[in-house]
Interface confidence: low
C-alpha cells in the first residue's frame, strides 16, 4: 500500500517536532522552579493525544484539555502583556521587564511558540508534509485550536491592568481577525480587569502622527468599553529608545516622550 | 507497504565483531524511534538500543553500553556495531521501529548471529 | 534493573475459551500505563497487539483485550482460536529511558 497523504496548503509539522516539544519543556521546567513538579514526557503524552490520529480539521478545544490540565500555570494577573503582530518586540520587552509575562512566557506558549504540527486520521504518524492553512483548508486546525485555547485561557486569567503592544506600521492597527481581537478581547473578564492599555509601536523614525486616533484603535476602544472594561492607549514613538529605558530607567533621556 | 529488514548476521568468532544493517523500504526513517531487539535461541525477547532518527539521540539497555553502538546511516538504513561478542550474544537480532519510543510497531524478519569458535 | 514477569507459563486453553496472562514490573511502568503486549510466533519477529497497557493495535481482532496499570497488567484472550497459538510477551518502558520485555507466556490451544 503506497503512502498517500492528505495535501493540505500550509507548511508540514516542523522537523523534529516531537524532540523540540520535549526539549523545551525540560529547559523551561529548569529554568522557572514553580514548574519543577511538570512532566514533562506526560505533557508530550498529551500534546500528542490532543492531534494524533485525528482528523487535522476536526480538532476542538476539548482535545487540549488534557494538556492544559498538566500546563496549568499561575502567572501574575496585573503582570500580563498582550500583543498582535509584533510578536518580537513584546517577548524583548518581557525578557528585560521580567516581572511581566507574554503568552509565550508561560509553559505552554513557549513549547508551541513558532511550530506547526498535524496529524493524520487513523494513523499514528505526525504528517511532515503538509498541516491545514486556516484561510485555504480549515480553522479547526491542529495549531490554530491550540492558540485560540491557550489565549483565551490567558486571557481570562488576566486582572487589574492589561498591556497590549500593537504594531503601528499595519493597516490594521486593530485587526478583528487577529488572536487578540477575535479571542483574547473577548474573554477579559470585566469583573476583574479595570483597564486594558495599549501600546501603539510606531516603525518610522520620523512618525509622529497620533496613532491612537487611527479608526481601528477607535474600534477597540468601542469593543472594550462595551464590555466595562477601560480604555488607554499610548504612542510608542522610538521603540528602540523604549526598550532602552525599560533596561535603564534612570537615563536622562527617558524622561522625554519615547 | 512499509518494511524493514536486517542485514549482516553472520558467523563469528569469540572477541570478534560485526555489523548488522536496518533497511526501511517503502518508507523513511522521519521522527521515528528504530531500535534493535535480539532473541537468543528458546528465549524470550531483549531491549538493546534505539536511536531517535529526528535528532540523532541514542539510547541502550545498560549492558550494552560500550560494546554495541546504533547510529543512522542515511534515511532509511540504520546500524548496529557490535565489538567483543561472546557466544553469549547468538541470537536473532531484529529492527524494530516506533512511532514513539515506548511501544514496537514495526518488525524487520530478523537475522541470525552466531558467536562460535 | 526492571524485572518483568509474567505468569502462567505455559497456558493451555480449549478452542472458544478465555485466557487470561498476567504481567507484573518490579516497578511502575512510566506515566502507569506505558506498557505493550505482542504474539509472536515460531521463525516470526513479534506482532504488537495493544499499546498504552489498553489499547488495541490496528488489525489487531477485538477479542484481545487489556487492562492495568502501574505494576500489574493483564491480557485476555477471549473465544480462543487455534490461530492464537503462540508466545506473548510484555514489554515496558521507563522513563530512563529504558525498554524491558517480559519472559514471555506460551500459550497452547487444544
Known amino acids: 500500500v503506497p503512502r498517500w497523504r492528505q495535501q493540505w496548503s500550509g507548511p508540514g509539522t516542523t522537523k523534529r517536532f516531537p524532540e523540540t516539544v520535549l526539549a523545551r519543556c525540560v529547559k523551561y521546567t529548569e529554568i522557572h522552579p514553580e514548574m519543577r513538579h511538570v512532566d514533562c514526557q506526560s505533557v508530550w503524552d498529551a500534546f500528542k493525544g490532543a492531534f494524533i490520529s485525528k482528523h487535522p480539521c476536526n480538532i476542538t478545544e476539548e482535545d487540549y484539555q488534557p494538556l492544559m490540565k498538566l500546563g496549568t500555570q499561575t502567572v501574575p494577573c496585573n503582570k500580563i502583556l498582550l500583543w498582535s503582530r509584533i510578536k518580537d518586540l513584546a517577548h524583548q520587552f518581557t525578557q528585560v521587564q521580567r516581572d511581566m509575562f507574554t503568552l509565550e512566557d508561560t509553559l505552554l506558549g513557549y513549547l508551541a511558540d513558532d511550530l506547526t504540527w498535524c496529524g493524520e486520521f487513523n494513523t499514528s504518524k505526525i504528517n511532515y508534509q503538509s498541516c491545514p492553512d486556516w484561510r485555504k483548508d480549515c480553522s479547526n486546525n491542529p495549531v490554530s485550536v491550540f492558540w485560540k485555547t491557550v489565549s483565551r485561557r490567558f486571557a481570562e486569567a488576566a486582572c487589574d491592568v492589561v498591556h497590549v503592544m500593537l504594531n503601528g506600521s499595519r493597516s490594521k492597527i486593530f485587526d478583528k481577525n487577529s488572536t487578540f481581537g477575535s479571542v483574547e478581547v473577548h474573554n477579559l473578564q470585566p469583573e476583574k480587569v479595570q483597564t486594558l492599555e495599549a501600546w501603539v509601536i510606531h516603525g518610522g523614525r520620523e512618525d509622529s502622527r497620533d496613532l491612537c486616533q487611527d479608526p481601528t484603535i477607535k474600534e477597540l476602544e468601542s469593543i472594550i468599553s462595551k464590555r466595562n472594561i477601560q480604555f488607554s492607549c499610548k504612542n510608542i514613538y522610538r521603540p528602540d529608545k523604549f526598550l532602552q529605558c525599560v533596561k535603564n530607567p534612570e537615563d536622562s533621556s527617558c524622561t522625554s516622550e519615547i | 507497504q512499509e518494511q524493514l529488514e536486517e542485514s549482516g548476521g553472520d558467523l563469528v568468532k569469540p572477541e570478534g565483531s560485526l555489523t548488522l544493517t536496518c533497511t526501511a523500504s517503502?518508507?523513511?526513517?522521519?521522527?521515528?524511534?528504530i531500535c534493535w531487539v535480539r532473541q537468543a535461541p528458546g528465549k524470550g525477547l531483549e531491549w538493546i538500543a534505539c536511536?531517535?532518527?529526528?535528532?540523532?539521540?541514542t539510547y541502550y539497555a545498560s549492558w550494552a553500553k560500550g560494546r554495541f553502538s546504533i547510529s543512522k546511516t542515511s534515511s532509511t538504513t540504520v546500524t548496529l556495531q557490535m565489538t567483543s561478542l561472546t557466544v553469549a550474544d547468538t541470537a536473532t537480532y531484529f529492527c524494530?521501529?516506533?512511532?514513539?519510543?515506548?511501544?514496537?510497531?514495526?518488525w524487520g524478519p530478523g537475522t541470525l548471529v552466531t558467536v562460535s569458535s | 534493573a526492571q524485572v518483568l514477569t509474567q505468569t502462567p507459563s505455559p497456558v493451555s486453553a480449549a478452542v472458544g475459551g478465555t485466557v487470561t496472562i498476567n504481567c507484573q514490573a518490579s516497578?511502575?511502568?512510566?506515566?502507569?500505563?506505558?506498557l505493550a503486549w505482542y504474539q509472536q510466533k515460531p521463525g516470526q519477529p513479534p506482532k504488537l497487539l495493544i499499546y498504552?497497557?489498553?489499547n488495541l493495535a490496528s488489525g489487531v481482532p477485538s477479542r484481545f483485550s487489556a487492562s492495568g496499570s502501574g505494576t500489574q497488567f493483564t491480557l485476555t484472550i477471549s473465544e480462543v482460536q487455534s490461530d492464537d497459538a503462540a508466545t506473548y510477551y510484555c514489554?515496558?518502558?521507563?522513563?530512563?529511558?529504558?525498554?524491558?520485555f517480559g519472559g514471555g507466556t506460551e500459550v497452547v490451544v487444544k
Open positions: 498504552r497497557a489498553s
Open positions: 536511536i531517535y532518527a529526528g535528532s540523532g539521540n
Open positions: 517503502g518508507f523513511s526513517f522521519s521522527n521515528d524511534a
Open positions: 514489554q515496558a518502558y521507563y522513563r530512563d529511558p529504558t525498554t524491558a
Open positions: 524494530a521501529s516506533a512511532d514513539t519510543i515506548d511501544y514496537f510497531n514495526l
Open positions: 516497578q511502575s511502568v512510566y506515566n502507569n500505563n506505558y
